[in-house]
Interface confidence: low
Amino acid sequence: RKIPKVGHTFFQKPESCPPVPGGSMKLDIGIINENQRVSMSRNIESRSTSPWNYTVTWDPNRYPSEVVQAQCRNLGCINAQGKEDISMNSVPIQQETLVVRRKHQGCSVSFQLEKVLVTVGCTCVTPVIHHVQ
Amino acid sequence: GITIPRNPGCPNSEDKNFPRTVMVNLNIHNRNTNTNPKRSSDYYNRSTSPWNLHRNEDPERYPSVIWEAKCRHLGCINADGNVDYHMNSVPIQQEILVLRREPPHCPNSFRLEKILVSVGCTCVTPIVHHVA
């Protein structure tokens, strides 16, 4: 029998799969590649023509509890003279990640997967105006 | 693990840290947010450090499709539409968490996996190294 998976394609279920109650999934939160490190160019948030700052958000009922969000420093972009050029726009670049949310209902605890939109950094773009028909 | 304040009226058996294995609801909260960056904005074309988006598909992972950015140029696009090599297009990378099927092919058993993705590109002033 084919079993639907998260993401709408199908797999033949191997015999070795652990039993899981209906409507839920088993999740091991021991992270694979936990010690992987980002190897971005140094200080790009300050050297960018669309510079950004970082803010750390903390939630003890979320795993991971710490999520870093970027915020563009300017509406415009920084030109060669180091001045803000408002004919261009600094815009956020976003990426989805998954977190595990812990919910307390009375004395019982349940866990929920959640998609979180993280602002990763900013880029400089030419603006556009859309006219809706 | 993560320490949380415990409801004082609850029995002390509850672990303050996240357990290593949890049963989670199959419904993912905020599941229907845009996952295709080509559809959600055209920044990749309008940026002064434009990038191409490459589809990375893995059926053993959720989400099974992830888009990877690759900067189109070493330099940045100037006001005349030409590549200026006095500036650099560099990728913005981010660690994200995904679900990896464990054991493989199992429909409802996963492990969290951290992966590094390039989300887009930004234009930076280059670091010039002077050799003594």
């Epitope: 726009n89 602002t119 603006p127 859309h130 809706v132 | -």
Partner: nanobody, 122 residues
Framework: EVQLVESGGGLVQPGGSLRLSCAAS??????MGWLRQAPGKEREFVAA????????YYADSVKGRFTISRDNSGITMYLQMNSLRPEDTAVYYC?????????????????WGQGTLVTVSS
């Protein structure tokens, strides 16, 4: 959950101007919009601005007369309404949404303010 509070509505003569404000608090959004509902009519799209502030969208009926903008922080959105007409009379709502596709579809907005009444009459 995003909380939205509108202000700036009121009574104005035809040809006059008003500036509406909408203060947002809470989680991020992809777009913020102004929608309006005239007495006995369906709610309709007026204008929207992307969360980054660089993309703006207007309904044909207000193009050239209304300008949508937001502050640097993205917390407050504005609608500058010039050359107002009696047919602009409505309750104006501020709302947020995820995604930039079909911003003119009022059903796609998730969080709504309580609305502010704009009356254009001589």
């Amino acid at each position: 959950e995003v909380q939205l509070v509108e202000s700036g509505g009121g009574l104005v003569q035809p040809g006059g101007s008003l500036r509406l404000s909408c203060a947002a608090s809470g989680r991020t959004y992809d777009a913020m919009g102004w929608l309006r509902q005239a007495p006995g009519k369906e709610r309709e799209f007026v204008a929207a601005i992307s969360g980054s502030g660089d993309d703006t969208y207007y309904a044909d009926s207000v193009k050239g007369r209304f300008t949508i903008s937001r502050d640097n922080s993205g917390i407050t959105m504005y609608l500058q309404m010039n050359s107002l007409r009696p047919e602009d009379t409505a309750v104006y709502y501020c709302a947020t949404r995820r995604g930039l596709y079909y911003v003119w579809d009022s059903n796609d907005y998730e969080n709504w303010g309580q609305g502010t009444l704009v009356t254009v009459s001589s």
